[in-house]
């Protein structure tokens, strides 16, 4: 194509551009350390930093870890991309009761409508099953005020979702998608220092580097990538996502390429001292099932929530953590709410896995 020749020649004398024969045009040459976001960049803004696998480039041009969907109740909805985080959602048959950035902090099984009720809307990854009376005007038989409450006007009662047993971070028992080999390896390799948090095996299906666009010698088909478990912060630096490996924490949102993982206290615990993207100290929630009162809320969105009477009004409650230390005053944003799972969960001062027996009492699982 002789007509392309003059255009090609104009690139030769310009060190900031090169000629791409495939697209037959002049392309902007990205500076060292930056890589094109498209085949033929036209301007400096078409060049980006290269993050490590499992990191994405956030709005502030920082490599930030993509969230992980390795928890057993999560599945990947969208993959980790160079400029957006992986997105996780609750696996089929479950819905998200506590949302998190690009993920779900807590999934519950979809409710089964109780006797006298039928499904109005089937459960999704975001919402629980919505039930309605089988015959209009007939109210459902409420076995106890804990399982059923008078609906607010315009809301429809739901059956209680079945909570997932709270998993502790035990390498040998944590369900690992993609095989158990690594979990067993991790269990044998990880040595815990005294009083340090336990560690968790990583799914063997994700050995460390997610595939990236090939980067031929001398070309710039790379994007800024941080190492796994790092995200690109606002300053364009790869920064470690917080880890939720402490026994009293659960992952609220996964590590994304441009945002940190966030952690929250596990069910049955409340945050006494907050920390960036996490909680520095979780304390056991007082357990007074007989004293709880129901708090009305939009039943179509969430499960029944129980509100504990103010601390100090419960004769059989001990809000003091296991170590005997009095809890710090809770942050103003932390409401004293116990969900239906928390009311069944006792804090156990070990790293042994916890299961709930049919009586609702915790059972230590030896593995």
């Amino acid at each position: 194509f002789p007509q392309d020749r003059p255009f090609e020649d104009t690139c030769h004398g310009n060190p900031s551009h090169y000629y791409d024969k495939a697209v037959r045009r002049c392309c902007y040459r990205c500076p060292m350390g930056l890589f094109p976001t498209q085949q033929c960049p036209q301007r400096p803004t078409d060049c980006r930093k290269q993050c490590e696998p499992d990191y994405y480039l956030d709005e502030a041009d920082r490599c930030t870890a993509c969230v992980t969907c390795s928890r057993d109740d999560l599945v990947e909805k969208t993959p980790c991309a160079w400029n957006s985080s992986r997105v996780c959602e609750c696996r089929p048959g479950m819905f998200c009761s506590t949302s998190a950035v690009n993920s779900c902090a807590r999934c519950f099984f979809h409710s089964v409508c109780p006797a006298g009720m039928i499904v109005k809307f089937p459960g999704t990854a975001q919402k629980n099953t919505v039930c309605e009376p089988a015959s209009p005007g007939v109210s459902p038989a409420c076995a106890s005020p804990e399982n059923c409450k008078e609906p607010s006007s315009g809301t429809i009662p739901q059956a209680k979702p079945t909570p997932v047993s709270p998993a502790t971070s035990s390498a040998s028992t944590m369900p690992v998608r993609g095989g158990t080999r690594l979990a067993q390896e991790a269990a044998s390799k990880l040595t815990r220092a005294p009083d340090s948090p336990s560690s968790v095996g990583r799914p063997s299906s994700d050995p460390g580097l997610s595939p990236t666009q090939p980067c031929p010698e001398g070309s710039g088909d790379c994007r800024k990538q941080c190492e796994p478990d790092y995200y690109l912060d606002e300053a364009g630096r790869c920064t470690a996502c917080v880890s939720c490996s402490r026994d009293d924490l659960v992952e609220k949102t996964p590590c994304a390429w441009n945002s940190s993982r966030t952690c929250e206290c596990r069910p049955g615990m409340i945050c006494a001292t907050s920390a960036t993207n996490s909680c520095a100290r979780c304390v056991p929630y007082p357990i007074c099932a007989a004293e709880t009162v129901t708090k009305p809320q939009d039943m179509a969105e969430k499960d029944t929530t129980f509100e504990a009477p103010p601390l100090g009004t419960q004769p059989d409650c001990n809000p003091t953590p296991e170590n005997g230390e009095a809890p710090a005053s809770t942050s103003p944003t932390q409401s004293l709410l116990v969900d239906s799972q928390a009311s069944k969960t006792l804090p156990i001062p070990t790293s042994a896995p916890v299961a709930l027996s049919s009586t609702g009492k915790p059972v230590l699982d030896a593995g």
């Epitope: 340090s196 460390g208 990236t212 031929p216 190492e227």
Partner: antibody
Framework: QVQLVQSGSELKKPGASVKVSCKAS????????IHWVRQPPGKGLEWIGY????????DYNQNFQGRVTITADKSTSTAYMELSSLRSEDTAVYYC????????????????WGQGTTVTVSS | IELTQSPSFLSASVGDRVTVTCKAS??????VAWFQQKPGKAPKVLIY???YRESGVPDRFTGSGSGTDFTLTISSLQPEDFAEYFC?????????FGGGTKVEIK
Amino acid sequence: QVQLVQSGSELKKPGASVKVSCKASGYTFTTYTIHWVRQPPGKGLEWIGYINPSSGCSDYNQNFQGRVTITADKSTSTAYMELSSLRSEDTAVYYCARRADYGNYEYTWFAYWGQGTTVTVSS
Amino acid sequence: IELTQSPSFLSASVGDRVTVTCKASQNVGTNVAWFQQKPGKAPKVLIYSASYRESGVPDRFTGSGSGTDFTLTISSLQPEDFAEYFCQQYHTYPLTFGGGTKVEIK
């Protein structure tokens, strides 16, 4: 087991370039990034940069930007670190390193190190 | 992120309890590792994530701290522990190391 074997000592003149190799074995080379760290005599450690052998993409400490090039040859499972425009303060032991391969989180602390390559820059 | 290690040098006897500190110029969470290095050898990881002991590391080595202040403690110094110790932050790139603490025989 994981092993990182580096090339031998180098004596270079100021202004010259040096290319140090790091041959990996005992694991799938393209699965983990290879990092380079240096240690001047009697001093601390300084991170230089890393390469993703799978994609060929690299990232460098800005202190070395423009002078360092990290590459990888998948066929031989070898990473290379080339430092140009050498000066006397580049005299150091250069290490290649790899992060650990277990745990739920893949943070970059180094569990595996090469034996080190001494680079001396002297006129 | 700068890491300031102290002391830079200490003399101790076998059986002593030794404490090395590492202060970060900004919050690094628990993203700190501790290394031991003997002359002419590559560093060897002792502690990662501030308090996790690497497999095979004796339990006399303990790591603690979070945020900006970290400590490596050797509860009862053994002859093989005389070496140089470095902290590393891996919270933010570029990765940085402390200046080192040389533990020598008194």
